[in-house]
């Protein structure tokens, strides 16, 4: 069931001020702007739908150009607090507190968040990024220090009249590239309050959020060029699906990413390239304009649909999971990283995915639509789709329950 | 522009050894890979190998394995053709050749360096 | 090994002929066959991959088909700097071999 029509109150099918609101540079996120404390601080924030925490660059870092300075604030309180997120690799400490909160191209309200003010950090900002902080859109489930700690999305919803939805547009940068700088610049937009209906072509496939921690989602089938990976769809969500815009790739569990990669190579002409162009360590390239996309396979996820037994399908291209790389010693070569790569946390839907589609995080429904972005690098030949329905039985055995652990040992 | 430049060429003697070079410049050496093609006088082209810089995978032709050695020192984005156990029959003109990992083609060439073996 | 057969081994043409050249490989190799066109001493120079695409700053007169085993290069109106030898090349999973030129020259 597309859905197309029965939108809520409030889903304007316009919204103007919020398309191309969105920033960044292909590989480093997507970021957006926002203002902090009285008077507005600005700040280019991260937009991660991966994580739950609103967290600013609060000291000075040689990564930063601008921080939050919250002793300039007249609107900052302090929460007494605490924060410390690790990831796998680097991470992040803070203050907890509370300021005023805008978005400049967003709806036009002002909020009481909560910030995490970062005073110590370590690979977490990235040098030349142009972002100075993380807005995560998850749910509170997964927010550090606990899930006592509203993150931003919730607290607008609650103080506003902004219905529980908003929705992505991640648009991919292909080429060419801008030759003045080191990566290419890519944009999009991002959607508070609503469905933009410019943004997308065809229909939207809504797919459950089986569990309101991160927007996890259920694969019950995987096709590379249209052949089946004819794996137990358990794998394809082990130990979960999420869909992260903080994520640059698709990420898959070991497993998966051992079969896709052997599909892929079958269903090209690839024999020869390195071996670590399929770790995603090494570039592989082209004359300018003579990229052979068509000598790579499409990739399909089939996604659980909202009705019992029935499923729909995404599909991405080379385009997508090809991710430029600016060469800073030639402009005369189109260079690739190989954008899929192997997980031991699941399955990751990143900017590789999301790039081709208009995604909508229907939080009031629960659950998350997926068309045709109208901004997603094709070629004459192939686009991506999102298509359905299809039938599946037994859907629900394709999520994988795991194991209740003390979430203070969990790792972002 | 792209530009591949053979040296090393000259006159050895049978059973000799001798290395040739190729300087690579205008293009992003580890994204391709790099082909050794010689041309014996007044006859056609043969394969002799090549290299993937990046990852130093390396394939040769029959005629050629376990004489000739190809490697790269991506720091000088540099290929070398390591000729052992030279014969009469090696003599040629050594192009090398930039080629995309797919097509496998090569789809620029270097004017070549002579390679004479005679006693 | 994969052998590459090209006929004929030399042929007569005038400006604004049409020419065609055949390569016809031992075992099948798909589209995985290149022409390149080599003028004396010179260094060759791609004119086509993947059995009929034109690779880029090459003219349009140059056009290349087939697949399986049976390939051809047709020059559509010869022109005098066509005057050259050329190669054909396949390039399957197998190492890469080449036909033995054909030589067009003046008539």
């Known amino acids: 069931e597309t859905d197309e029509e029965s939108e809520e109150p409030g889903r304007r099918g316009s919204f103007v001020e919020m398309v191309d609101n969105l920033r960044g540079k292909s590989g480093q996120g997507y970021y957006v702007e926002m203002t902090v404390g009285s008077p507005p601080q600005t700040l280019n924030i991260l937009v991660d739908t991966g994580s739950s925490n609103f967290a600013v660059g609060a000291a000075p870092h040689p990564f930063l150009h601008r921080y939050y300075q919250r002793q300039l604030s007249s609107t900052y309180r302090d929460l007494r607090k605490g924060v410390y997120v690790p990831y796998t690799q680097g991470k992040w400490e803070g203050e907890l507190g509370t300021d005023l909160v805008s978005i400049p191209h967003g709806p036009n309200v002002t909020v009481r968040a909560n910030i995490a003010a970062i005073t110590e950090s370590d690979k977490f900002f990235i040098n030349g990024s142009n972002w100075e902080g993380i807005l995560g859109l998850a749910y509170a489930e997964i927010a550090r220090p606990d899930d006592s700690l509203e993150p931003f999305f919730d607290s607008l919803v609650k103080q506003t009249h902004i219905p529980n939805i908003f929705s992505l547009q991640l648009c991919g940068a292909g080429f060419p590239l801008n030759q003045t700088e080191a990566l290419a610049s890519v944009g999009g937009s991002m959607i508070i309050g609503g469905i933009d209906h410019s943004l997308y072509t065809g229909s939207l496939w809504y797919t459950p959020i089986r569990r309101e921690w991160y927007y996890e989602v259920i694969i019950v089938r995987v096709e590379i060029n249209g052949q089946d990976l004819k794996m137990d769809c358990k794998e394809y969500n082990y130990d979960k699906s999420i869909v992260d815009s903080g994520t640059t790739n698709l990420r898959l569990p070991k497993k998966v990413f051992e079969a896709a990669v052997k599909s892929i190579k079958a269903a090209s002409s690839t024999e020869k390239f390195p071996d670590g162009f399929w770790l995603g360590e090494q570039l592989v390239c082209w004359q300018a304009g003579t990229t052979p996309w068509n000598i790579f396979p499409v990739i399909s996820l089939y996604l659980m649909g909202e009705v019992t037994n029935q499923s729909f399908r995404i599909t991405i291209l080379p385009q997508q999971y090809l991710r430029p790389v600016e060469d800073v010693a030639t402009s005369q070569d189109d260079c690739y990283k190989f954008a899929v790569s192997q997980s031991s946390t699941g399955t990751v839907m990143g900017a590789v995915i999301m790039e081709g589609f208009y995604v909508v995080f229907d939080r009031a429904r629960k659950r998350i639509g997926f068309a045709v972005s109208a901004c997603h690098v094709h070629d004459e030949f192939r686009t991506a789709a999102v298509e359905g329905p299809f039938v599946t039985a037994d859907m629900e055995d394709c999520g994988y329950n795991i194991p209740q652990t003390d979430e203070s040992t969990l790792m972002t | 522009e792209v530009q591949l430049v053979e040296s090393g060429g000259g006159l050895v003697q049978p059973g000799g050894s001798l290395r040739l070079s190729c300087a690579a410049s205008?293009?992003?050496?580890?994204?391709?890979?790099i082909h050794w093609v010689r041309q014996a006088p007044g006859k056609g082209l043969e394969w002799v190998g090549w290299?993937?810089?990046?990852?130093?995978?390396?394939d040769y032709a029959d005629s050629v394995k376990g004489r000739f050695t190809i490697s790269a020192d991506t720091s000088k984005n540099t290929a070398y053709l390591q000729m052992n156990s030279l014969r009469a029959e090696d003599t040629a003109v050594y192009y090398c050749?930039?080629?995309?990992?797919?097509?496998?083609?090569?789809?620029?060439w270097g004017q070549g360096t002579l390679v004479t073996v005679s006693s | 090994d994969i052998q590459m057969t090209q006929s004929p081994s030399s042929l007569s043409a005038s400006v604004g002929d049409r020419v065609t050249i055949t390569c016809r490989a031992s075992?099948?190799?798909?589209?995985?066959v290149a022409w390149y066109q080599q003028k004396p001493g010179k260094a060759p120079k791609l004119l086509i991959y993947?059995?009929?695409f034109l690779y880029s700053g090459v003219p349009s007169r140059f056009s290349g088909s087939g697949s399986g085993t049976d390939f051809t290069l047709t020059i559509s109106s010869l022109q005098p700097e066509d005057f050259a030898t050329y190669y054909c090349q396949q390039f399957p999973t197998y190492l890469p071999t080449f036909g033995q030129g054909t030589k067009v020259e003046i008539k």
């Open positions: 050749a930039r080629g995309p990992f797919s097509p496998w083609v090569m789809d620029y």
């Open positions: 290299i993937s810089p990046a990852g130093g995978s390396t």
């Open positions: 205008g293009f992003t050496f580890l994204g391709y890979g």
């Open positions: 993947s059995a009929s």
């Open positions: 075992q099948d190799v798909s589209t995985a």
